[in-house]
Each structure stands twice: as structure tokens, then as C-alpha cells.
Interface confidence: low
């Protein structure tokens, strides 16, 4: 399924090259996008063509901070937006319950070492339902062709992934069991130890459990013990696949 999303996303990527001395990286963004009022949209950026280490990604709307994904501290959503903004997928951001006021420029700001800062721009237009439908009519033939191609590719990928997973299932099951026993017994991921990428830390001093895809939906926020200045996280972000 993730492969499908990646393929679909790749169709709309726009290159945003940076002309800045030694900085070789490129931010790819979803470019100009439109969505229907009341709906939701995924904002995506991807940093490529650099070996720089990503330490943090900021999402901003004009001058307002929406969210941050920090390599060590995980996700943080601005209190003003926490009801309508969800972290992910990946390092992207999902905006929900869109209003016309959400129309505007959005920026993904990648903090990297040693390159410095890379910025990508996305323009979002939130349309009234009728306008969105009207605009969609002109895109249907092209989208249909793209969708058909993608369905074929996706189906193939799903079949391959499913078969691979089936083979691995028994092995993974036993590994997970070992992990659970280990963490419950030894508290290897104690409150003062970092949680592994893609996981989040449960409340109080309990060892961290493995959680849903970088989202921490099933997990409590990081307990205050973890951070006594206002870095409240929703689980770690993994930057390992971000550059290339």
C-alpha cells in the first residue's frame, strides 16, 4: 500500500532546485494543489540529491508554524492546529476539515547537516464543493488513464508484497514476541532512552511499545519526564529514507 501511495505521489512531484553554493540537494514538492472545502489534503515534500543528514522538518503556513518533525524528538503539532493537522504520512502533513481560509502558501523547511536549510513551497487552493467538481470534469480523461496504469502497477506490487509478507509472517511473529518479553523484563527503552525510529514512547515509565507507522496513533504523547521544555511529541520520525 505504501508503494502505491509513493507511486501516486510521484506523479505529481514538482522539482524546486536550490541555487546556493555547496548545497546540492533538491526539494521535490506536490506543487500547486487544490482540494475541496471540508475535505483533507496531504502536503508532501521530499529531499533528494544530497547526502546531508536531515535533523528536522518544519511545516509552516505563511508565518505560522504548523508542525515539526525532529529526528530525536519526534512530531510536534502547534496547539493552534492540533485539531485539524495530523502528522504524516512519512514526513508529510495531513490537513483536515479544510476551509477557504486554508488557501495559501505552505512551506516545508528541511534542516540538514552540513548543508543547512532547504525550503520547498506548496500552494494550496481550497475550493467550494461546486467549483471543485467543475474543475474535476476537465481532469477526468487524463486522471483515468493515469489511474488505470497505476492500478495495474499497484496490483502487481500488492501481490508481490503480500507474498513476501506471508513468507516473513511467522518469523516476524516470533521476533515480536521476543521483543515484548525483552522490553517488559528489562525496560530497555526506559523513559531516559530514545525510542527507536517509527515508534513512540508510552506514558509514565513504561517501556515503549511498537506503534503505528510513525504516527503514534495508539500511543500516549511522550511523558513529561522526557521533555520538560515544550517539546511534546507524537512519536519519532524516521529520516532514513529521506535523502538519496
Amino acid at each position: 500500500m505504501r508503494w502505491c501511495l509513493l507511486l501516486i505521489w510521484a506523479q505529481g512531484l514538482r522539482q524546486a532546485p536550490l541555487a546556493s553554493g555547496m548545497m546540492t540537494g533538491t526539494i521535490e514538492t506536490t506543487g500547486n494543489i487544490s482540494a475541496e472545502k471540508g475535505g483533507s489534503i496531504i502536503l508532501q515534500c521530499h529531499l533528494s540529491s544530497t547526502t546531508a543528514q536531515v535533523t528536522q522538518v518544519n511545516w509552516e503556513q505563511q508565518d505560522q508554524l504548523l508542525a515539526i518533525c525532529n529526528a530525536d524528538l519526534g512530531w510536534h503539532i502547534s496547539p493552534s492546529f492540533k485539531d485539524r493537522v495530523a502528522p504524516g504520512p512519512g514526513l508529510g502533513l495531513t490537513l483536515q476539515s479544510l476551509t477557504v481560509n486554508d488557501t495559501g502558501e505552505y512551506f516545508c523547511i528541511y534542516h540538514t547537516y552540513p548543508d543547512g536549510t532547504y525550503t520547498g513551497r506548496i500552494f494550496l487552493e481550497v475550493l467550494e464543493s461546486s467549483v471543485a467538481e467543475h474543475g474535476a470534469r476537465f481532469q477526468i480523461p487524463l486522471l483515468g488513464a493515469m489511474a488505470a496504469t497505476l492500478v495495474v502497477i499497484c496490483t502487481a506490487v500488492i501481490v508481490v508484497v503480500a507474498l513476501t509478507r506471508k513468507k516473513k509472517a511467522l518469523r516476524i511473529h516470533s521476533v515480536e514476541g521476543d521483543l515484548r518479553r525483552k522490553s517488559a523484563g528489562q525496560e530497555e527503552w526506559s523513559p531516559s532512552a530514545p525510542s527507536p525510529p517509527g515508534s513512540c514512547v508510552q506514558a509514565e515509565a513504561a517501556p515503549a511499545g511498537l506503534c503505528g507507522e510513525q504516527r503514534g496513533e495508539d500511543c500516549a504523547e511522550l511523558h513529561d519526564y522526557f521533555n520538560v521544555l515544550s517539546y511534546r511529541s507524537l512519536g519519532n520520525c524516521s529520516f532514513f529514507t529521506e535523502t538519496g
Epitope: T55, A71, P79, S80, S192, Y225, S230, Y231
Partner: antibody, heavy 118, light 107 residues
Framework: EVKLEKSRGGLVKPGGSMKLSCVAS????????MNWVRQSPEKGLEWVAQ??????????HYAESVKGRFTISRDDSKSSVYLQMNSLGAEDTGIYYC?????????WGQGTSVTVSS | DIQMTQSPSSLSASLGERVTLTCRAG??????LSWLQQKPDGTIKRLIY???TLDSGVPKRFSGRRSGSDYSLTISSLESEDFADYYC?????????FGGGTKLEIK
């Protein structure tokens, strides 16, 4: 422009009281966790107290050395944070800084000098 | 309380020189560490947080690193405005605690 305007400090007798205030401008004060930090030649920089957000029911935390004597409070409508200091002793002498923190944003005010002496 | 041991307590260096200040945490702090700069007039500014993330507007000559329980702040090429006091701050658990500071002086 971000500003954290301090109140006047001053000289107070041992056992006395003093209230410090800090007025913020240039940022969304209500989103920020606010702290008081003090500095003295003897102890260096020392965190004193913290107050969180409305959504956290304005939860407060204090350093052990000031618990029961100091009270931190805030008024979001006035973008202000306060530190009420009672039963002051010589060990409370120092420069008091107000500090605002919201994820990657971090602001410090100018220090206010407090001297406890008879 | 978590003890933060900062070294050296003072350091003399020349313009253009590369300097490294270190901080050792007495307990695991998992990268929850920031570096602060205090100018002679008392103004405090955070330079780095999460051990290595540079604050907005801070020159790239500043960088932070973590190696186990040792944390370092490196200034790659000193400029005149860098001569100040530097402190590390852990915020992994209450109470947040500071290092004793490093006074960086011009040679």
C-alpha cells in the same frame, strides 16, 4: 519584533516578598510554556519555575528550593507571566530571567536583579 | 537532579580559530540538550537544541554533536561577536539543569 519586558527588581529584606512580572510581545504568548530562571555567582544558572498552557490547565512546576515560597502565574489576555516570591532569603539573590519556549522557538527576557539583604 | 559538567570553564582563543566546548551528562538525557549563549550585557540566546539542531538565525559556524553522554558545541571559525559565556542545558527531566558555563575570551 519579539520582546519580553521585565519589571523592576530591587532590594528586599530577608523574609520579605516581591513580585516579578514579564510582558511579552511579538509572538503568540498563549502557545508558550513560560519559565523563570535565575543566575547568581554562587549557583550559576538555575531553573526556578514553569507554567504551561491553558490546555494543560496551567500546570506549574517548581525547583525544590522554592517550592511553597514562590508562585508562578500567567495572564494570557495580558501576555504576562508573574513570579510571586515570599519568605525570601539571601540564597534567592540573583538575576531573574523570564523565558518562553514553544518547540523550536525560544525567547529570553533581559534579567531583573533581585537582592535579598538586611 | 541531573548533573551537567561543562568544560573548560574558561577558554582563550583567537579570531578565526576553531573551538569546542563540551558538556557531560551525569545521567542519560537522550539528546534533550541545548546550548545557550550569554553576552556580556546579560542577554541570553539559545543556539542549539536537541543536541544538534541549529536555532533559526544562528550562523552555521556553530554546530552541536552528541557522543553517548558527551555533548559538544563547536564554533568552526571564531568571530568577534562569539566571545561570550556558553551554557549547556538539559531538559530531559525536572528540574532542567545547566552546566557551569564556559567563558570564551579573546586571546
Amino acid at each position: 519584533e519579539v520582546k519580553l519586558e521585565k519589571s523592576r527588581g530591587g532590594l528586599v529584606k530577608p523574609g520579605g516578598s516581591m513580585k516579578l512580572s514579564c510582558v511579552a510581545s511579538g509572538f503568540t504568548f498563549s502557545n508558550f510554556w513560560m519559565n523563570w530562571v535565575r543566575q547568581s555567582p554562587e549557583k550559576g544558572l538555575e531553573w526556578v519555575a514553569q507554567i504551561r498552557l491553558n490546555s494543560d490547565n496551567y500546570a506549574t512546576h517548581y525547583a525544590e528550593s522554592v517550592k511553597g515560597r514562590f508562585t508562578i502565574s500567567r495572564d494570557d489576555s495580558k501576555s504576562s507571566v508573574y513570579l510571586q516570591m515570599n519568605s525570601l532569603g539571601a540564597e534567592d539573590t540573583g538575576i531573574y530571567y523570564c523565558h518562553g519556549n514553544f518547540y523550536d522557538l525560544d525567547y529570553w527576557g533581559q534579567g531583573t536583579s533581585v537582592t535579598v539583604s538586611s | 537532579d541531573i548533573q551537567m559538567t561543562q568544560s573548560p570553564s574558561s577558554l582563550s582563543a583567537s579570531l578565526g580559530e576553531r573551538v569546542t566546548l563540551t558538556c557531560r551528562a551525569g545521567q542519560e538525557i537522550s539528546g534533550f540538550l541545548s546550548w545557550l549563549q550569554q553576552k556580556p550585557d546579560g542577554t541570553i540566546k539559545r543556539l542549539i537544541y536537541a543536541a544538534s539542531t541549529l536555532d533559526s538565525g544562528v550562523p552555521k559556524r556553530f554546530s552541536g554533536r552528541r557522543s553517548g553522554s558527551d555533548y559538544s558545541l563547536t564554533i568552526s571559525s571564531l568571530e568577534s561577536e562569539d566571545f561570550a559565556d556558553y551554557y549547556c542545558l538539559q531538559y530531559a527531566s525536572y528540574p532542567p539543569t545547566f552546566g557551569g558555563g564556559t567563558k570564551l575570551e579573546i586571546k
